[in-house]
Amino acid sequence: TALSPTPTTMTFTPAPLEETTTRPEFCKWPCECPQSPPRCPLGVSLITDGCECCKICAQQLGDNCTEAAICDPHRGLYCDYSGDRPRYAIGVCAQVVGVGCVLDGVRYTNGESFQPNCRYNCTCIDGTVGCTPLCLSPRPPRLWCRQPRHVRVPGQCCEQWVCDDDARRPRQTALLDTRAFAASGAVEQRYENCIAYTSPWSPCSTTCGLGISTRISNVNARCWPEQESRLCNLRPCDVDIQLHIKAGKKCLAVYQPEEATNFTLAGCVSTRTYRPKYCGVCTDNRCCIPYKSKTISVDFQCPEGPGFSRQVLWINACFCNLSCRNPNDIFADLESYPDFEEIAN
């Protein structure tokens, strides 16, 4: 073969363009725009198209994109053309993989590991630097040592324990201690130095439709800060939930479709059906967010190629609160939620 690409796990096959009858272009000059800008669905940004011509509703995660129909920059999305090489005509909106970090004036890319000094190994994860110690000193000398001290050793990075009453140290004990330390191994010591940390899940990247939520956790074998992600869908974009609000009420906290359906992702379908709960909407200024939820694992089967599983937010209950801004403003998600007293129906 004339090309040997590194295999990719999932590829996107774009719909073929009308080959010879129409021009496979997406920008036209001079610009031709409708008289009034479109009204975007809940949670979708109104932006200038990639031709720098007209106002359009930004393409969302998983949507097709072109040089004209660009992805929502406010959500950190970009058009991934890798499924349409070498034409680069139609792509899929994908999530930019995390933001970098700056530490002491040095910029690190998301996921990059580095050593700011000889005592720590750090990793940049989505703007947060997490570090684990490299100086994994053994525990202080055992009972025989009455005056242990932690001292710097010339030419060495890590401090070491010394015992001022070395002369009285029994030989047999010394031998046992050395063995005990050798047998303990670095993994056990690293774990002993590890303070378990898991951040809260970030708000869903979309207010409706499929989005992504992330968190950072070092609860793993290496005590290493790693970014975890899960899919989330706070509410469907294509259902007018307001129609389901009961007479005399202003909110529907939870919306649950009557029929169980399969989840779909990138052309792949969940191996079983689900009847998820979604957060509802209000007719006043309140917005509804999850307050009881968990993460479930969903198995997907693809028409071609192997299946895969994804972590998915599973909503059990939602509440409606007063801290809302324009629903097309992604940053509204970052508002701190008020006390539970403000929950109303």
Partner: antibody, heavy 117, light 107 residues
Framework: EVQLVQSGADVKKPGASVKVSCQAS????????IHWMRQAPGQGLEWMGW????????GYAEKFQGRVAMTSHTSTSTVYMELSRLTSEDTAVYYC??????????WGQGTLVTVSS | DIQMTQSPSSVSASVGDRVTITCRAS??????LAWYQQKPGKAPKLLIY???TLQSGVPSRFSGSGSGTDFTLTISSLQPEDFATYYC?????????FGQGTRLEIK
């Protein structure tokens, strides 16, 4: 302004390796593939391969299989092309270029690699 | 691999002339053809992509046409800065291939 800036000219002996860098600015490196082409003195353009800086995936022309390696370092927005087991026939100007709809735009300014004993 | 053949390999013309360069693909590439201009000591510059779409910032005297296997680049009224070498390139399938180039010289 979207720009690709390449490393300076290099002279190598036959059998050696050369590593050419290509630094992107004015856009997010991980959003587009980078391709490498070369042009021998007085000759036409020859495509060598591509790299996706986001995933690290690569694809190489059969002619260069086994002696070319394309890598990326996203924190410095830089892509590298290393060609090993050089011969005099590898003397050329090497270009990096961003994969765009139906073509390459922009191109780096080019790096002259001379292989001479 | 898809072979790209340009003709003529060189052409002499004067300022104000209309010049046409052709490019033929050894198999159907739909409209996935790009045209580049290269001046001595410089990198190629994208003029036209998808057979007929003018790249932003390129003067309108450049135009492209064709589909399938036969394509043309036309310069409607030559300007002094247009004297250069022009390459076609297919972007339909890997490996990407270029034409051998057409040198446009001052008559």
């Amino acid at each position: 302004e979207v720009q690709l800036v390449q490393s300076g000219a290099d002279v190598k002996k036959p059998g050696a390796s050369v590593k050419v860098s290509c630094q992107a600015s004015g856009y997010t490196l991980t959003s587009y593939d980078i391709h490498w082409m070369r042009q021998a003195p007085g000759q036409g353009l020859e495509w060598m391969g591509w790299i996706n800086p986001n995933s690290g995936n690569t694809g190489y022309a059969e002619k260069f299989q086994g002696r070319v390696a394309m890598t990326s370092h996203t924190s410095t927005s830089t892509v590298y092309m290393e060609l090993s087991r050089l011969t005099s026939e590898d003397t050329a100007v090497y270009y990096c270029a961003r994969g765009a709809m139906g073509g390459f735009d922009p191109w780096g300014q080019g790096t002259l690699v001379t292989v001479s004993s | 691999d898809i072979q790209m053949t340009q003709s003529p390999s060189s052409v002499s013309a004067s300022v104000g002339d209309r010049v046409t360069i052709t490019c033929r693909a050894s198999q159907d590439i739909s409209r996935w053809l790009a045209w580049y201009q290269q001046k001595p000591g410089k990198a190629p510059k994208l003029l036209i992509y998808a057979a007929s779409t003018l790249q932003s910032g390129v003067p309108s005297r450049f135009s492209g046409s064709g589909s399938g296997t036969d394509f043309t680049l036309t310069i409607s009224s030559l300007q002094p800065e247009d004297f250069a070498t022009y390459y076609c390139q297919q972007a339909n399938t890997f490996p990407i291939t270029f034409g051998q180039g057409t040198r446009l010289e001052i008559k």
